[in-house]
């Protein structure tokens, strides 16, 4: 799937709206230097992306996000503002009904939370020049 | 859909280097989520290092400043370089490749890592 066709600005203000400020709720209780990222995507179909990568899939030490309250309503931007997207999840809805739904949130997921403010930070000004 | 092979297991010594390679072949390597997976004798097979299609890394704290995980989208390979190995490194490692869409995953064979202390 190309997030090219993407209306980003509608994304963008989903984002502002809601997705950061579940965001924060999640990384509640940790200092803004704790962790040490340094995340970059090139441009805004490379940041959604690598957002999807990290929302959606489990990465070293940190099981699922998926369930999430950010996770949740990004998914549902990305499905309402990106054409074709919501064909792509199938399988993946389907997969997340098997596991079981014990939640923690560990150091990791909250470094990976991280990572992904970071990304959402970097779809919000695509003008910039990469570091 | 992806193939992917391994490569670069062996016995070393503790306290020495190694490096893995993953070799990929079919479509979809390029945007897929990486990752490196350790399973030892008598122990569920354990996510080690992940990557992204841009680069981004995560590892479990036994491995963090020893092991990189790195990619070549160029050239369809991923790499796993382990220094400073112990002996509880030990194990067969395998890489897997996730479509970051709809969570289906290919793995390799697995490459065998032996630490002699």
């Known amino acids: 799937y190309d997030f090219t066709n993407c209306d980003f600005e509608k994304i963008k203000a989903a984002y502002l709206s809601t997705i950061s400020k579940d965001l924060i709720t999640y990384m509640s209780g940790t200092k803004s230097t704790e962790f040490n990222n340094t995340v970059s995507c090139s441009n805004r179909p490379h940041c959604l992306t690598e957002i999807q990568s990290l929302t959606f899939n489990p990465t070293a030490g940190c099981a699922s996000l998926a369930k999430e309250m950010f996770a949740m309503k990004t998914k549902a931007a990305l499905a309402i503002w990106c054409p074709g997207y919501s064909e792509t999840q199938i399988n993946a809805t389907q997969a997340m009904k098997k596991r079981r739904k014990r939640k923690v949130t560990t150091n990791k997921c909250l470094e990976q939370v991280s990572q992904l403010q970071g990304l959402w930070r970097r779809f919000n000004r695509p003008l910039l020049k990469q570091q | 859909e992806v193939q992917l092979v391994e490569s670069g297991g062996g016995l070393v010594q503790a306290g020495e280097s190694l490096r893995l390679s993953c070799a990929a072949s079919g479509s979809g390597f390029g945007v897929n989520i990486l990752y490196w997976y350790r399973q030892a004798a008598g122990i569920e097979r354990e996510l080690i290092a992940s990557?992204?299609?841009?680069?981004?890394?995560n590892y479990v704290d036994s491995v963090k400043g020893r092991f990189t995980i790195s990619r070549d989208n160029a050239e369809n390979t991923m790499y796993l370089q382990m220094n400073s190995l112990k002996a509880e490194d030990t194990g067969v490692y395998y890489c897997a490749s996730r479509n970051i869409f709809d969570g289906t995953t290919e793995w390799g064979q697995g490459t065998l890592v032996t630490v002699s202390s």
């Open positions: 990557i992204t299609s841009g680069g981004i890394t």
